[in-house]
Each structure stands twice: as C-alpha cells, then as structure tokens.
Amino acid sequence: EPPTACREKQYLINSQCCSLCQPGQKLVSDCTEFTETECLPCSESEFLDTWNRETRCHQHKYCDPNLGLQVQQKGTSETDTICTCEEGLHCTSESCESCVPHRSCLPGFGVKQIATGVSDTICEPCPVGFFSNVSSAFEKCRPWTSCETKDLVVQQAGTNKTDVVCGPQDRQR
C-alpha cells in the first residue's frame, strides 16, 4: 500500500517517499523506483540552508558598499552571507539591508553603550554629579570636578551639561 506520510528528511511524491536533498544541494529529479533522489550542489554564489526539495538554490546576499555594507561572514553552499555595516554606521534592521550613521548623544547625555555594526548608540541622561558638554557617539557622562580635593570651593554649581566651577576659598584674616 502506498505511504500517506514519510519519515523525517523525506517527502511524498507519486505515492512514494523520496529523500530530501541535504543542505547545500538542490533537487534535480525525484527518486524513482530504481534510484534515489538526484541532487546537485549549489554553485559558489548560492546556498540552501535546510533539507529541501528546492529546484533552485538561493542567491547569496550582496553586501552593497554603496549602502555602507560590508561582509561580516562569507556565505557557503549551506549558509547565506552575513553583512554588517562599515565603521561609524549600523544596520537599520535585523536583516541588515542598509546602514545609517551612529547617533550622537547630545549635551546632557552620555554614551551608555557604544554602537556596533548592528546596533545604534544608546544614550543615557547624565545623573546628578555628572555632565556632558559635547555631542558625541563615544563619550560617557563625566563626573563633576571635585573642588575639595584641589583645596578649592564650588563657585558655580554644575549641571548635566556643565562642570562645576571651582574657586579659591575665602581666607578670613
């Protein structure tokens, strides 16, 4: 009696179970009563990453330098090419189809996490005792200067954007 279901890594065709093609190979011809499934390897610029019955392989992703992309990992017959972004840029999506410049943290904010090829800069507001007076994609919030350690006194209080201003202590004669 012809099968109605097949084992894992097989498919049902013409009332018989044929082996799927292994990753990196495409289907050329179904199995017959005389032969196993005919499969052939994907070409150098192509891949298939699963056990399959695809009659054509998928084209490797192209990392377009005009979009700021570069190859992070070259594709094989079983894996797609992985793109990442050039220095100073990050991916706009998980599939990394294009890149945008890293965000800078405005004055009053510091860098919590420096951007990578796949993630943008993460900024955080400078807490009390810290400041940032620049727009930067790298600089963290810096602590206010400690006037006391310099034997000075605070002449002007600091903010999240400015450092304290220290001055000499008033000497009582």
């Epitope: 013409n14 011809s29 179904d30 017959t32 005389f34 032969t35 005919e38 695809e54 054509r56």
Partner: antibody, heavy 117, light 110 residues
C-alpha cells in the same frame, strides 16, 4: 504508469527543421530534470541537451548542438520538446528523451529522425 | 565538452567469467558517473549511478567503482542475459552542466 513517449520523428531534407515532443506521464514533470539523447544507426549514445526542473529551467547543450537545437518544456502539458534547425545528414538518429541528468533511470522508446535528400 | 573514453570497445567472454569495463573522463567529474546496458532495438537500461550505487532491481553481480576521472564497471559472473552493449555516462557539473557517453563496450559470447 510512469512513462515517456517521443513523437515527431520524420524523414526530412537537409536544411529542414523538425520539432520532437516527449509526453511524460505518471510522475511530477515539474520537479524533474529532463534530457535528450540520440543514437545514430549502429552507433553509440550521444548526449544532446538537458533542462533543469522547476521555474529555473536552465538549459545545457552538447557543443555541436548549441545554436541549432533548442530544448524546452511545457509544464502544463507535461511535455518536453527538442527544436532542431538546419538539419544535416549526420543528425540522422533515434532520439530518446530521458528523465534526469547525471543518471537516466527512465527512457522513452525513441523516435527516428532521418535526414536525407 | 568532456570526453568519456571507454575500453575495451568489445570483448568476448564466457558465462561465469568476471568482466571489467573501464571509463576515463577527460576532466574530474567527481562521482557523477552512470552505467547503462543496451540490447538491440531497446532503450538503454540504468545499472549503476553515482559511480557505485546499484539501481533497484539490478542484480548484485553488477558493481561500479571509481571517482574523479577513472571508473570501472564489473560483472562478477557473466550470465547469458548479460550479453549486450554497455555505456558509461559522465556529467561535469560546475559553472555549466555537460554530459557525455563513452563509445560503448559490446560484450559477445566467446
């Protein structure tokens, strides 16, 4: 029943054109590559052309067949074709269609093409 | 194109003999090699594919070996029904696909 049946063979004059057909039945025509092989009277087998399965339908030819012969298929009719142009006396042969490329487990019985003036 | 050189072109043997036919490809074809048997007035019949896999229903006295450029078909003990012509078919698969058959080996009764 799984079978291939060729037709279209004829006696033609040199320079003429002819289209051979191969009707496939009993299997999924769309997921199988197909080939044409010929055999001149009393001679050996000679690969002519192959066409890949599915939408890609990439075609490949023996160097002597390029430009003169064209392999094609009509999935809706489950039929394989071989268009032969500018026929020569040396094209006289039985033409077989077969399923597959690197191995040919299923063959038709062949159709005879005779090129003679 | 690839060339498949098959030898011998003919051989005479007796029932029970061990018969060996060789096939050489003009360039490496990995294991994309098949062997066929053809009897007069019939279409060829597939015996061996992928150089060494026996097609279902083919007697186990037939075996194939080799890879790259050199291949062999062996009939371990020739039977009366084995007198026929044998062909190898090699396929080069790379940037293009090209197939070719050997010239054939006619096995006749001694």
């Amino acid at each position: 029943e799984v079978q291939l049946e060729e037709s279209g063979g004829d006696l033609v004059q040199p320079g003429a054109s002819l289209r051979l057909s191969c009707a496939a039945s009993g299997f999924d025509f769309n997921s199988n590559a197909m080939s044409w092989v010929r055999q001149a009277p009393g001679k050996g087998l000679e690969w002519v052309a192959s066409i890949y399965a599915g939408g890609s339908g990439s075609t490949y030819y023996a160097s002597w067949a390029k430009g003169r012969f064209t392999i094609s298929k009509d999935t809706s009719k489950t039929t394989l074709y071989l268009q032969m142009n500018s026929l020569r006396a040396e094209d006289t042969a039985t033409y077989f269609c077969a399923r597959g490329i690197t191995r040919l487990p299923l063959w038709g019985q062949g159709t005879l093409v005779t090129v003679s003036s | 194109d690839i060339q498949m050189t098959q030898s011998p072109s003919s051989l005479s043997a007796s029932v029970g003999d061990r018969v060996t036919i060789t096939c050489q490809a003009s360039q490496s074809i990995s294991s994309y090699l098949a062997w066929y048997q053809q009897k007069p007035g019939q279409a060829p019949k597939l015996l061996i594919y992928d150089a060494s896999k026996l097609a279902s229903g083919v007697p186990s006295r037939f075996s194939g070996s080799g890879s790259g450029t050199d291949f062999t078909l062996t009939i371990s003990s020739l039977q009366p029904e084995d007198f026929a012509t044998y062909y190898c078919q090699g396929t080069y698969y790379g940037s293009t696909t090209i197939s070719a058959f050997g010239q054939g080996t006619k096995v006749v009764i001694k």
